[in-house]
């Protein structure tokens, strides 16, 4: 009798490797025998499609090699011309090991912008991508960020994130790797510390120093009153990435003089430009208006009580500021031979960093004044007896020299850290030191006080002391 | 105990004048920075001025040209001399005492411009 | 201008929590081995108030629950409050004296849950 077709077993969704064999069954049950068709997503899939075999008599369909493109919904459609045609349908996923089908490249890029390192992949299920940086796994923050398509997005690059890079991509069959690629990162000329301008006496010599940085290192040329230089020496030297030159000049004239840090980009150059005048007057005293430029401290004699690589102040207002200002100190620093020992390294702290103050940056950098509670402390504990002495000889006008008024500051006329903590420096020898304390009669005072706080010395002097005093 | 008291705020229109003045006491007002910072309504600190001990003064960009700030040390007084205002610039005016870190804020005086 | 990000922007915090506020600098703030990061509490209807300087310094008077952290040459200076307390409810601000302007970051309200 005839028999409308009934499929007994549906079709069921089929995992497939790449490459591999897929077979989808399509049983029939009917009489007389069924006209079996197939449809991929609908598109009847061809009998002499060569992609495909399709075998007794219909029920059995075989992709012989799948490819990713290969994915879908596959139906069986049975019909003998008795009752209706029947369907059973069934998906085919298609399953493939992690493939970089764009790998990053290398790539060269300005400090500041955005770099984006490439890495499509393909599988399913869909990979995973991750970056390493050199052999660490590389961790996102806020300025990066591994996109939905698995490209490395760095906002704002800084020098730190040049480096070898490479992306991985992993899912449950497999994982793929890139070949390693070079973020460089290229860094605009950039001057670290200008030409300063000098106000000298006829015939002095004058160092102009100035110090650029940038990747690939800048070259630097200086400029007089805009034609190159034609007298005078320069000196260079490249280190970490700056380079440093010194312009010495013998001054018969004044003159405009520009420092010009130049470096290559591709095609294109990046400068920076500093320029200094060098005028010719006479002399002139230390200003009140702190004239002058923040600098490293490369003398000798404060070096074991300035901090290690400390900005000082250099006051613009001596022809050679940094010359100058170390002869100061030596003077006096030879004078303090004859102290005390309790007085002496509490004296030389506050000589030092009363001569070289501590630079301070905010609207611009300038000097700051050593903080009341350690002049007092130097004063009137330390150094009482010959801190008397001295105001003894100052007013009776035995010093012939202004110095030794530069050595010794008017504690009353200091700022307190009690009312701006960042108003003035510390000296950290005189800081109180939990491990070794030392005992100092404490000093009286009825008006409010407070402590010197701890902080961590700046040299390997163990002087210690926890010394209260007045904050008006 | 330092104690910095701000006075002058006020209704304003656009394109109007104030002056505002800040007295100090309880420490050597003349040894220290000063600094004017404001707060618009509802928004964050936003900082206009300081001048160092020296007198000499410096501006955020939004008020360069416009306000000015200055002091006298005998009276213990910081001043800043609003010109040319704007409703934008309507805010509480803070005198703020610090160098780097704006350690001492007195209360506030509003300034309010508008038409 | 130094541009400064706060995160989060608000933040909820039973008594006793630990709350962190991060501050990133869009460059480096250290200067003469100090990196010059300032933290302040404004509580609400109040004038602010400086809770660290120098970006680890507690002021003279702030309750050691409140610290700050940041070293080197990095741009990212966290406040941490270890045990939040009732009247620690206030907006916080970040703010750098590196160069001029000096500039705040937007805040990050902190509110009892």
């Known amino acids: 009798l005839p028999k409308a077709p009934v499929i007994t077993t549906p079709l069921e969704t089929v995992d497939a490797l790449v490459e591999e064999v897929a077979t989808f069954m399509c049983a029939v049950e009917s009489y007389p025998q069924p006209e079996i068709s197939w449809t991929r997503n609908k598109i009847l899939i061809k009998l002499f499609d060569t992609r495909y075999s399709i075998r007794e008599n219909g029920q059995l369909l075989t992709i012989l090699s799948v490819e990713d493109s290969d994915d879908g919904i596959y139906c069986c459609t049975a019909n003998n011309g008795v009752g209706g045609a029947v369907e059973s349908c069934g998906a085919l996923q298609v399953k493939m090991k992690p493939k970089i089908t764009r790998p990053p490249i290398n790539v060269k890029i300005i400090e500041g912008l955005k770099a984006v390192l490439p890495c499509t992949t393909m599988g399913n299920p869909k990979p995973s991508v991750s970056w390493i940086k050199g052999d660490s796994p590389l961790r996102e923050n806020s300025r990066t960020a591994v996109l939905e398509s698995g490209s490395l997005r760095i906002h704002n690059v800084q020098k730190e994130d040049a480096g070898q890079y490479r992306c991985v991509a992993k899912n449950s069959l497999g994982t793929a790797y890139s070949k390693v690629v070079k973020l460089e990162v290229e860094v605009f000329a950039r001057i670290l510390r200008a030409p300063e301008s000098h106000n000298v006496t006829f015939g002095s010599f004058v160092t102009l120093h100035c110090t650029a940085t940038g990747i690939p290192v800048p070259t630097i040329t200086w400029i007089e009153n805009g034609n190159a230089v034609s007298s005078g020496s320069i000196q260079e030297s490249v280190k970490d990435r700056v380079i440093d030159s010194r312009l010495q000049l013998f001054i018969t004239k004044p003159g405009l003089y520009t420092c010009i840090a130049t470096n290559k980009h591709g095609e294109k150059f990046s400068t920076a430009k500093a320029a200094a005048t060098v005028s010719i007057a006479e002399w002139s005293k230390p200003q009140k208006d702190n004239k002058g430029y923040c600098a490293q401290y490369r003398g000798e004699v404060c070096n074991a009580v300035l901090a290690k690589d400390a900005l000082v102040f250099l006051n613009t207002s001596y022809a050679d500021p940094e010359e100058a200002q170390e002869l100061l100190v030596h003077t006096a620093w030879n004078e303090l031979k004859v102290v005390s020992p309790l007085c002496r390294p509490a004296a030389e702290a506050l000589l030092c960093n009363h001569v070289f103050q501590e630079c301070s940056p905010g609207v611009v950098p300038t000097p700051i004044p050593i903080c009341r509670e350690y002049c007092l402390a130097v004063k009137e504990l330390f150094c009482a007896k010959e801190w008397l002495a001295m105001e003894e000889k100052t007013h009776r006008g035995l010093y012939r020299s202004e110095m030794h008024l530069l050595s010794v500051p008017e504690c009353s006329k200091l700022p307190s850290m009690h009312w701006d903590p960042t108003a003035c420096a510390r000296l950290p020898h005189l800081d109180y030191n939990k491990e070794n304390p030392k005992t100092f009669p404490p000093m009286t005072s009825s008006k409010p006080s407070v402590d010197i706080p701890n902080l961590p010395s700046s040299s390997s002097s163990s002087f210690s002391v926890s010394p209260t005093y007045s904050m008006t | 105990e330092v104690q910095l008291v701000e006075s002058g705020g006020g209704l304003v229109q656009p394109g109007g004048s104030l002056s505002l003045s800040c007295v100090a006491s309880?420490?050597?007002?003349?040894?220290?920075?000063m600094n004017w910072v404001r707060q618009a309504p509802g928004k964050g600190l936003e900082w206009l001025s300081v001048?160092?001990?020296?007198?000499?003064?410096y501006y955020a960009d939004s008020v360069k040209g416009r306000f000015t700030i200055s002091r006298d040390n005998v009276k213990n007084t910081l001043y800043l001399q609003l010109n040319n205002l704007k409703p934008e610039d309507t805010a509480l005016y803070y005198c703020?005492?610090?160098?780097?870190?704006?350690?001492?804020w007195g209360q506030g005086t509003q300034v309010t411009v508008s038409s | 201008e130094i541009v400064l990000t706060q995160s989060p922007s608000s933040v909820t915090a039973s008594i006793g929590e630990k709350v962190t506020i991060n501050c990133e600098s869009s460059?480096?703030?250290?200067?003469?081995?100090?990196?010059?990061l300032n933290w302040y509490q404004q509580r609400p209807g109040q004038s602010p108030r400086l809770l660290i300087y120098?970006?680890?310094?507690?002021q003279s008077g702030v309750p050691d629950r409140f610290s700050g952290s940041g070293s080197g040459s990095t741009t990212d200076f966290t406040l941490t409050i270890s045990s939040f307390q009732p009247e620690d409810v206030a907006v916080y601000y970040c703010q750098q004296a590196y160069n001029a302007p000096l500039t705040f970051g937007p805040g990050t309200k902190v509110e009892l849950k």
């Open positions: 460059q480096s703030v250290l200067y003469n081995q100090k990196n010059y």
């Open positions: 120098w970006a680890s310094t507690r």
């Open positions: 001048i160092d001990t020296h007198s000499i003064a």
């Open positions: 309880g420490f050597t007002f003349s040894l220290y920075y």
């Open positions: 703020v005492l610090g160098r780097t870190a704006l350690v001492r």
